[in-house]
Each structure stands twice: as C-alpha cells, then as structure tokens.
C-alpha cells in the first residue's frame, strides 16, 4: 500500500494562472498510489462541483484534471485538488485570476434552453443562463406559423414575443409554461442582448397526449432531453 503522490510535479509548477476572461483554464494534479486514489476539487476551501457556474466544469478523473471554459471574473479564487486514498491524502493549490476583457455579446450557456418533452396538462420550465459584461435583457420567443408558413417572404421566421425581462449578469432566466397543450409544442428561443449585440439559442418543446392512467402509475411532469 502507498499513500498518494504526484506523478508529474513538474506539470504543476505554474501555481498562478492569470487568464483573460473568455479563455479556457485547465488545472491538473496527476497522481498515483495504492489503492488508486480519488480526486476532489475545492474552490476557496469549499467543495466545488461547478453547478453554479455558467458552462459548468469538466472533471476528467482519468486525467486528474479540472477544465473551465469561458472563464469570468466570478471564477477567480483558489482551486485545490485533494487526492486521497485509504493510506493518506495530498493537496495542491492553484490560484486563478481572471483578467477582465472588453464587453462582449452575451454568452448563453450551451444546452440551454434544453429540448423538452412534456405531457398535455403538465407544467414546463425552459431555462436560459446568460453571462454578459454589460447588463443584459432577455426575450423569450415562440416560433409561430402564419398562413401555413413559418417564414415570411424575406426569409425570416415568424415569432411571437412571450416575455421580456432585464436581468442581472449571470442570472438564470426561466420561461414557465403552465398546463401545456398540443398548441404549445414548437420551437422556443431565448434571446439575450446588451449594448454590443444579441445572442440566441433555441430549443424544441414536444407535447405528448395525456397518458392513460390505467397504463402509467405516475408520469413525470416534464422530461428534459438534450
């Protein structure tokens, strides 16, 4: 049996990472031991799973790495890799400084809003997560059909504005659809804008007929699929 140890300490010499906002950061703590150790990450001393981070994080345990894409000022801090097995534990601290960049178009978290399947009569939430230097505003749009067509003569889609909101940077914006019907099915777009420009992402809502209670004991209100 052997306590954890760093296998490539020369790759960990760069303790301070100062990167421009929008860049990708990768921290690695390659280690070994017997039994094979596990790795956990802390941010400023607290367990870090990235759930509150736009874009989330990528943990690649086989590479002993933490990857954060499109870093923002709120990502600044001390990142600790904690490697442990039954025999012992080791840790290493990285310091991340995010250099603020010029204001840019809003960045929307990938995969949001998410394609969603729901049953008639259920409630649906579509999420949109925005990062913007300048204060963003959001619109929720539904793509509609007019005279049998989804597009006008100019080639642009017909849309209906469902909701407009001004939000704080890095806030989650939610579109609530209550008691959905077949007519609610279709394409929904989250539009985020600031003084630099607009960004859009879309998702599809599929609405299934009401399930027969004799066949289904309990159906979830909504299923989220990527």
């Amino acid at each position: 049996q052997q306590a954890p140890y760093w296998t490539h300490p020369q790759r960990m010499e760069k303790k301070l990472h100062a990167v421009p906002a929008g860049n990708t950061v990768k921290f690695r703590c390659p280690a070994a031991g017997n039994p094979t150790p596990t790795i956990r990450w802390l941010k400023d001393g607290q367990a870090f799973h990235g759930e509150n981070r736009i874009g989330g994080i990528r943990l690649r345990h086989q590479h002993w790495s933490l990857v954060m894409e499109s870093v923002v000022p709120s990502d600044r801090g001390t990142y600790t890799c904690l490697v442990e097995n039954a025999v012992g534990s080791i840790r290493y601290n990285y310091l991340l400084d995010v250099l603020e960049r010029s204001p840019h178009r809003p960045i929307l978290q990938a995969g949001l809003p998410a394609n969603t399947t729901a049953v008639v009569g259920s409630d649906v939430e579509l999420l949109c997560k925005v990062y913007s230097d300048a204060q963003p505003h959001i619109q929720w749009l539904k793509h509609i059909v007019i005279n049998g067509s989804s597009f006008g003569a100019d080639g642009f889609p017909y849309v209906q504005v469902l909701k407009t909101a001004d939000i704080n940077s890095s806030e989650v914006e939610v579109l609530y659809l209550r008691n959905v019907s077949a007519e609610d099915a279709g394409e929904y777009t989250c539009l985020a804008g600031n003084s630099i420009g607009l960004s859009y992402q879309s998702a599809w809502l599929t609405v299934l007929p009401e399930e027969d209670p004799t066949w289904t004991a309990a159906a979830p209100e909504a299923r989220y699929t990527d």
């Epitope: 499109s70 960049r101 010029s102 204001p103 840019h104 178009r105 960045i107 929307l108 990938a110 300048a134 204060q135 505003h137 619109q139 749009l141 006008g152 100019d154 642009f156 849309v159 504005v161 407009t164 539009l191 804008g193 600031n194 003084s195 630099i196 420009g197 607009l198 960004s199 859009y200 992402q201």
Partner: antibody, heavy 124, light 112 residues
Framework: EVQLLESGGGVVQPGRSLRLSCAAS????????MHWVRQAPGKGLEWVAV????????YYADSVKGRFTISRDNSKNTLSLQMNSLRVEDTAIYYC?????????????????WGQGTMVTVSS | DIVMTQTPLSLSVTPGQPASISCTSS???????????VYWYVQKSGQPPQLLIY???NRFSGVPDRFSGSGSRTDFTLKISRVEAEDVGVYYC?????????FGGGTKVEIK
Amino acid sequence: EVQLLESGGGVVQPGRSLRLSCAASGFTFSSYAMHWVRQAPGKGLEWVAVISYDGSNKYYADSVKGRFTISRDNSKNTLSLQMNSLRVEDTAIYYCVRGAGRGYTYGPDGFDIWGQGTMVTVSS
Amino acid sequence: DIVMTQTPLSLSVTPGQPASISCTSSRSLLHSDGKTYVYWYVQKSGQPPQLLIYELSNRFSGVPDRFSGSGSRTDFTLKISRVEAEDVGVYYCMQYIEAPLTFGGGTKVEIK
C-alpha cells in the same frame, strides 16, 4: 425612412471642447444601442463609443476614454458626444451608427444604419 | 483588442471579372450562439460606409447577389463574382463580437 443626422462639427483649437449631436428618425430610438465611429482624413474607420438603449451602459475606445462622454435623450431621439481636451489626432468625420435593438430583429442586429457624418477639425 | 488585417491594400479589376478580398482576425469571431460576427462594408467616395454582408455570409437587404461572404473563425473572404463600375470604393471588414469594435484597414477597389 430610417435616418441619422449628425451636427455640431467644426474647427476647434487643441485643448478645447465640442459637442456633437445626432438626430434619429424613422425608428424607435429608445430601443436601440447607439455608437459613434470616426474616420480621420484619408484613413480607415475607428470605433469611438457605444451607449445602451437606456443609457445605463457606456463604453469607450482607449484613445478617447476620460475625454469623451456619450449620452442620449430618448425623449428627443438624440444622441450626443461631448468631446473635451481635444487633440489634433481627433480630427475626423464622426459618424453616428445604430446599434443592437432591445429585442428580436430581422436581419443584422445593428451597424446597419449610418449617418452622413460631421467633420471635426482640431487645429491651432 | 481584436486586430482585423485586410489584404490586399488595393485591387484593380476589369469589369465582369471576379474580385476577392481577405480579412483575418486575431481571435475567433465564432460566438457561443454559433454565429460568426464579421461584417463587410463598402464606402464610396464622400459617403458613409454601407453594409454589404452581416454575420459572415448574410447579404443585407438590397445588396446584389454578386456579393458573397465566407470563411470561418479567423479567416474571412468577400467575393464579387463580376465586378461592375458601381462597385468602386473602399471595402472594410469589421468584427462585431466585442468592444472595442474593430475594422480592417480597408481595400481600395478600382476599375481597370
């Protein structure tokens, strides 16, 4: 017809001030960010500043930061550029440009409509 | 700041012949929403710039279909399939992804 009309240009000595205005018509001015772009004689285009639709956000090129102030009066459909401590290198045609709208737009989200420009000459 | 580098500086074209202008950005202009925010303008003598192409390849309303934009991430091209006398002017590319918005140095197109 969508239109932007700049005014206020002229000849001024280095160190002095000048205020440019841009009158907007033919669109809902209060729903659009607005920019100033300049072009020195015989040279290329240089972005100067932007202001959000409600005036809450303003950004400037490093070359004018601390000297120029962008502002707007949505009740009068007017965009302004207050230029202080003018330098010889500020000599240029100043264009007012429509930026991104507050909501869904068909086509480009801004930088589609330019004014005719107003000439500013800084010379001793 | 994002640097936009345009080539060539000038171009002399026979009417009816094609013309091509290149533009390179110092950083990718492909945004998280999947769009590439490069715009192309032409500036004719004594006039403000006029928008030709937006978001890499979309022709602005009223722009003849002999103009086309293409490219990806950092390398962009404006093509005129058959140059006409009215196409004389200075052509600029612009990045519209972050402030400060930046322009290429311009390409002067003249007729032989």
